[in-house]
Interface confidence: medium
């Protein structure tokens, strides 16, 4: 629970397939076997129609059939649940595995991968059991597609639910230099390993990754709370030697015009190994992609106890400046800058339309208004719901709710 950021463990609410908060009109598919197995019948635990969505074509070998859910607004999707076909208890069709694709704008689609690059998710073993899949890393998405798989020609059917919460931060993407490798007694890989945008010429752009996944790094950047990952996994880092300018520059794009109160950057400060808090931060603001940067940059010098090796969240006041794009320079104060999380405290400027196509109707199950005073961006819970419990151990563990 970094100040200003969300706690992923609390972002696990059913998003509305089972309880029909997601309307039929927001559920679609590449094809359907019949009207009685149309996309609208794909709600978890529902027995409507013939008890599931079933595609018209075979999913083997092409794996091109998909079920699509439009959440209408950006959400952080932390889990998905799947079931096979009900059919009055007589259904035999289910999907033993599937892939996920997601989009924030309806144009660019990304394939979900786990922390080790695995795309295929284990699905169901029978038609009735619900299998929940913890998504590590989670997806920030408006649209999610399920692509069922099979290892031979056979019928597959699917019922689904998505779990997560509203992405209140409004961050669409960040642009940053590619993270580097620090060589100690072992190599420490400080790359953004879950970034879902593009990488060209040492620059990552158009996506989100580890700096927006809610996972805050440990004091010792070589260690991680994640299981079976490499040294440096939680952090993205850059060496002063590679930046003659003396700073790392990042750009942040948001969903709509916002008044920014603060930026919170979780930084490592293990100075005995070269990691230092930034010496200062300078941010510029603009309202559109082709517009000029507006006004004076906001400058913030960082003080505090230089001998203190704790990782910490640095709060950078942004003075209520209005923008949709921010460009921030983080000044080196030592050999390395290591960040594990960046988040923003902001309020949507009234009457600003979303950057993404179409209008986003207000989600009625979310309390309106600004974030609560403790700045937890994503902890507003849908009324009357309990979050799905986090399984102990592996962050991508599957468990059954039969």
């Amino acid at each position: 629970d970094m100040k200003g950021h969300f706690d992923p463990a609390k972002c696990r609410y059913a998003l509305g397939m089972q309880d029909r908060t997601i309307p039929d009109s927001d559920i679609s598919a590449s094809s359907s076997w019949s009207d009685s197995t149309a996309a609208r019948h794909s709600r978890l635990e529902s027995s409507d129609g013939d008890g599931a969505w079933c595609p018209a074509g075979s999913v083997f070998p092409k794996e091109e059939e998909y079920l699509q859910v439009d959440l209408q607004r950006l959400h952080l999707v932390a889990l998905v649940g799947t079931q096979g076909r009900h059919a009055g208890g007589l259904g035999k069709e289910f999907s033993r595995s599937y892939r996920l694709r997601y989009s924030r704008d309806g144009r660019r689609w990304m394939g979900w991968k786990d922390r080790w690059g695995q795309e295929v998710i284990s699905g169901n073993e029978d038609p009735e059991g619900v299998v929940l899949k913890d998504l590590g890393p989670p997806m920030v998405a408006r649209l999610v597609r399920f692509y069922p798989r099979a290892d031979r020609v056979m019928s597959v059917c699917l019922r689904v639910e998505l779990y997560g919460c509203l992405w209140r931060d409004g961050l669409l993407s960040y642009t940053a230099p590619v993270g580097q490798t620090m060589y100690l007694s072992e190599a420490v890989y400080l790359n953004d390993s879950t970034y879902d945008g593009h990488t060209v010429g040492g620059l990552q752009y158009g996506g989100l990754g580890q700096l927006a996944d809610g996972v805050v790094g440990l004091d010792d950047f070589r260690k991680s709370q994640e299981l079976r990952v490499w040294p440096g996994y939680d952090y993205v880092g850059w060496s002063n030697h590679s930046f003659s300018s003396g700073y790392v520059e990042m750009e942040f794009e948001f969903d709509r015009l916002r008044a920014f109160q603060a930026m919170q950057v979780h930084c490592n400060n293990m100075h005995t190994l070269g990691a230092r808090l930034p010496g200062g931060v300078e941010c510029r603001f603009r309202r559109g992609p082709a517009m000029a940067w507006e006004g004076e940059p906001m400058r913030h010098n960082l003080g505090g106890n230089l001998g203190d090796p704790r990782a910490r969240a640095v709060s950078v006041p942004l003075g209520g400046r209005v923008a949709r794009f921010l460009q921030c320079r983080f000044l080196f104060a030592g050999p390395w800058l290591l960040f594990s999380e960046i988040s923003f405290i902001s309020d949507v400027v009234n009457n600003s339309s979303p950057a993404l196509g179409g209008t986003f109707p207000p989600a009625p199950w979310w309390p309106p208004g600004p974030p609560p005073t403790n700045f937890s961006s994503l902890e507003l819970e849908p009324r009357g719901q309990q979050p799905v419990a986090k399984a102990e151990g592996s962050p991508t563990i599957e468990f059954r709710m039969d």
């Epitope: 440990l218 004091d219 005073t373 700045f375």
Partner: antibody, heavy 117, light 107 residues
């Protein structure tokens, strides 16, 4: 579960030195930092010193000349030594840890130290 | 060293009341302020860190806010078990100084 337990002599004569041990369980001293804080009877809290996970230290400058902190990671123990005690050093001495939160999230139950002849 | 001036020193309230405690730092401490609760005969317990983030398991009636030099701690609806002394602490620069404490007593 996480536990910290202080052990000390209870009574110390004026001008003598004090040695207190903090024994921890449920976490490793190589990943967490240990602070010492004291509280005179009926009064507030005073931060004394911290030993960071890597073994480096930061002292309260007002007391630095009298304090010494060390640790044994393998035994999960942290040691505080304070010299030249006076009656106004009478207090409950707590050890507390900080980890990934920038705050002291677990405290020991404290050990009472009385400086008296 | 940074001085944390905490007010008031004493509060006498009834169950159900709203309580506000303030802490003023002698210089800016960003939002590196922590609030602790110490019940009689017990060691302090962490309630709020980073000025406004509630620690795991802390009831949501406890909230904190502030940035720079002025910080506020609020109990929205006091309950009998909230009888305790509350301390602020700056965690910005060593020595990590505490406020003098606020003793909350229930009528």
């Amino acid at each position: 579960q996480v536990q910290l337990k202080e052990s000390g002599p209870g009574l110390v004569a004026p001008s003598q030195s004090l040695s207190i041990t903090c024994t921890v369980s449920g976490f490793s001293l190589t990943s967490y930092h240990i602070h010492w804080v004291r509280q005179p009877p009926g009064k507030g809290l005073e931060w004394l010193v911290v030993i960071w996970s890597d073994g480096s230290t930061t002292y309260n400058s007002a007391l630095k000349s009298r304090l010494s902190i060390s640790k044994d990671n393998s035994k999960s123990q942290v040691f505080l030594k304070m010299n030249s005690l006076q009656t106004d050093d009478t207090a409950i001495y707590y050890c507390a840890r900080t980890g990934n939160f920038y705050a002291m999230d677990y405290w020991g139950q404290g050990t009472s130290v009385t400086v008296s002849s | 060293s940074i001085v944390m001036t905490q007010t008031p020193k004493f509060l006498l309230v009834s169950a159900g009341d709203r309580v506000t405690i303030t802490c003023k730092a002698s210089q800016s401490v960003s939002n590196d302020v922590v609030w602790y609760q110490q019940k009689p005969g017990q060691s302090p317990k962490l309630l709020i860190y980073y000025a406004s983030s509630r620690y795991t398991g802390v009831p949501d009636r406890f909230t904190g806010s502030g940035y720079g030099t002025d910080f506020t701690f609020t109990i929205s609806t006091v309950q009998a078990e909230d009888l305790a002394v509350y301390f602020c602490q700056q965690d910005y620069s060593s020595p990590y100084t505490f406020g003098g404490g606020t003793k909350l007593e229930i009528r």
